[in-house]
Interface confidence: low
């Protein structure tokens, strides 16, 4: 989905900005896990129907899908169960939160409250520690990409009820030893760090005793630093084309960025004759503008009832905080002239024609073009 | 100050076509799904639609699908109702209705167009 | 679709008395989804009170909504001259949304 925030006015008062679901959670949990996704509603009021979809497909209840109107809970999590996890308002389909899962072998990490391994009452008068869950605890090295959240569990049992405590690198590991501080769950014999930053990599222990002894494991964390990219336009994408007068046309830009990008359709543009600035850069219009919450965004600029105006030189623009990607095409428009057009009414969505052609508004783009509102323009028909 | 205004008072003959509009303003209207809500006289509430002016997606309750068309410039901060051939029935006052954010209820409401259908 | 029923459909009153109205739902509406308007003649309708009983901004405390399932109330705990008006609720969790067709509540 994505938020569409057309800027043909620069310059405008700033509007009061609606709230926008979150970013992208990233999030890790281990194999046979249970994933479990929270998603509140904005202001902590109620919150409309909603339905949870994961890869673009809605989920389906059952015994271990538990799916509920701001919570979803997967039990015995695979490597099928990884992907991108949505909540949406069931009838407008408005993504609300989005998370991206990610399943690994790994003992585990995420932050899951599925309460499973609570101490249990084994029927055993007394007894030292011993792990309820070993088999979860194969997998002693945990690699996660930056900014993720990590758990460990050392789901443990015992008479009387051990107690357990957490080493970083052989010594007592506290909150105040992170930024971002950790979460303890006791009950959940587990140790949570969200957001992982590489400061966080190590050898986490955990510490399993009562008065009859004493267990440990000791877990390794590397934390993969991201190197971000400046987005890619796929090669080949859009591509120039040719268009009969009065027929529609629809370009393609295919964009991938890890980081969230700002896209935008851009027009080439003559004002006063001219198609540079005094300064020598071109002015351009923007048609489009959103902000993509994929990391992968096929995105459409379709022109309806094309004219001669709508020939011309195009942009698709990606922008991310690393840089600007962006491909230039051609759009040319030929055969039997149109009547005279008509002058279209501005109520009429799509097609409002300025009278004069001044420049109302100027704002520098990335130090390479001059950004005009459409108003001072010809405006094109699209949709 | 969300604000959302509609246009004036129509009188039309029946076969013609009419649209009306609703401006908002104070809140990013791309980002608020717009609701038409149908009020004949001396009756209740009935929905007809919703339209989302980022991309113009709409949802069209079944009773009124095919019957009228929503559509939005979100250049201009406008969504439309339109009819393209109007009938007696039509008469009725039309408000439209900004949902709140999480797209459920009526939150900000405008304050109608009465349209009359009259030969 | 969601049939709701309101009930009673006129409701007679004296400011500072207490204001008891229903809305019936033909099946369950889940999760209390569920919303109440007021519309003052000539007026355009006004959120009240969504989620079945989360008052909205602005809203004062004497309006209150309950309920859930099938059957909901909204409670005006006591008449101010200014709530003399027709009341509608709203359910929005299964399309088509649908209103209840009123009930007016006016000065005895």
């Known amino acids: 989905e994505s938020l569409g925030t057309e800027q043909r006015v620069v310059g405008r008062a700033a509007e009061v900005p609606g709230p926008e679901p979150g970013q992208q959670e990233q999030l890790v949990f281990g194999s046979g896990d249970a994933v479990e996704l929270s998603c509140p509603p904005p202001g902590g009021g109620p919150m409309g129907p909603t339905v949870w979809v994961k890869d673009g497909t809605g989920l389906v209840p059952s015994e271990r899908v538990l799916v509920g109107p701001q919570r979803l809970q997967v039990l015995n999590a695979s490597h099928e169960d990884s992907g991108a996890y949505s909540c949406r308002q069931r009838l407008t389909q408005r993504v609300l939160c989005h998370f991206s899962v990610r399943v690994t072998d790994a003992p585990s990490s995420g932050d899951d409250e599925d309460g499973e391994d609570e101490a249990e009452d084994t029927g055993v008068d007394t007894g030292a520690p011993y792990w309820t869950r070993p088999e979860r605890m194969d997998k002693k090295l945990l690699a996660v990409p930056a900014a993720n959240t990590v758990r460990f569990r050392c789901p443990a049992a015992g008479n009387p009820t051990p107690s357990i405590s957490w080493l970083k690198n052989g010594r007592e590991f506290r909150g105040e030893h992170r930024i971002g501080g950790i979460k303890l769950r006791h009950q959940q014999w587990s140790l949570v760090m969200e957001s992982v930053v590489p400061s966080d990599r190590g050898n986490y222990t955990c510490v399993v005793e009562n008065k009859f002894g004493s267990i440990r494991q000791t877990y390794t964390l590397d934390v993969l630093e991201r190197s971000p990219h400046r987005p890619i336009l796929q090669a080949g994408l859009p591509a120039n084309q040719t268009a009969v007068l009065g027929s529609d046309v629809e370009f393609h830009c295919k964009v991938y960025s890890d980081a969230q990008p700002h896209i935008q359709w851009l027009k080439h543009v003559e004002v006063n004759g001219s198609k540079v600035g005094p300064d020598g850069t071109p002015y351009v219009t923007v048609l489009k503008s959103w902000i993509s919450e994929s990391v992968e965004a096929d995105v459409r600029l379709r022109l309806a009832n094309v004219s001669e105006r709508d020939g011309g030189e195009y942009l698709c623009r990606a922008t991310n905080f690393i840089g600007v990607a962006e491909k230039a095409f051609w759009l040319s428009v030929h055969g039997p002239r149109a009547a005279e057009e008509e002058l279209v009414e501005a109520d009429e969505a799509g097609s409002v024609y300025a009278g004069e052609q001044k420049l109302i508004s100027e704002e520098d783009l990335g130090g390479e073009q001059k950004l005009i509102s459409e108003e001072d323009l010809h405006h094109h028909h699209h949709h | 100050e969300v604000q959302l205004v509609q246009s004036g008072a129509e009188v039309k003959k029946p076969g013609e076509s009419l649209k009306i509009s609703c401006k908002g303003s104070g809140y990013s209207f791309t980002s608020y799904w717009i609701a038409w809500v149908r009020q004949m006289p001396g009756k209740g509430l009935e929905w007809m639609g919703i339209?989302?002016?980022?991309?113009?997606?709409?949802r069209y309750s079944p009773s009124f699908q095919g019957q009228v068309t929503m559509s939005a410039d979100k250049s201009i901060r406008i969504a439309y109702l339109q009819w393209s051939s109007l009938k007696a029935s039509d008469t009725a006052m039309y408000y439209c209705a900004r949902l709140d954010y999480s797209g459920s209820w009526f939150d900000y409401w405008g304050q109608g167009t009465l349209v009359t259908v009259s030969s | 679709e969601i049939v709701l029923t309101q009930s009673p459909g006129t409701l007679s009153l004296s400011p500072g008395e207490r204001a008891t109205l229903s809305c019936r739902a033909s099946?369950?509406?889940?999760?209390?989804?569920l919303a109440w308007y007021q519309q003052k003649p000539g007026q355009a309708p006004r959120l009240l009170i969504y989620g079945a009983s989360s008052r909205a901004t602005g809203i004062p405390d004497r309006f209150s909504g309950s309920g859930s399932g099938t059957d909901f109330t909204l409670t005006i705990s006591r008449l101010e001259p200014e709530d003399f008006a027709v009341y509608y609720c709203q359910q929005y969790g299964s399309s088509p949304w649908t209103f209840g067709q009123g009930t007016k509540v006016e000065i005895k």
């Open positions: 099946q369950s509406v889940s999760s209390s989804y």
């Open positions: 339209i989302y002016p980022g991309d113009s997606d709409t």
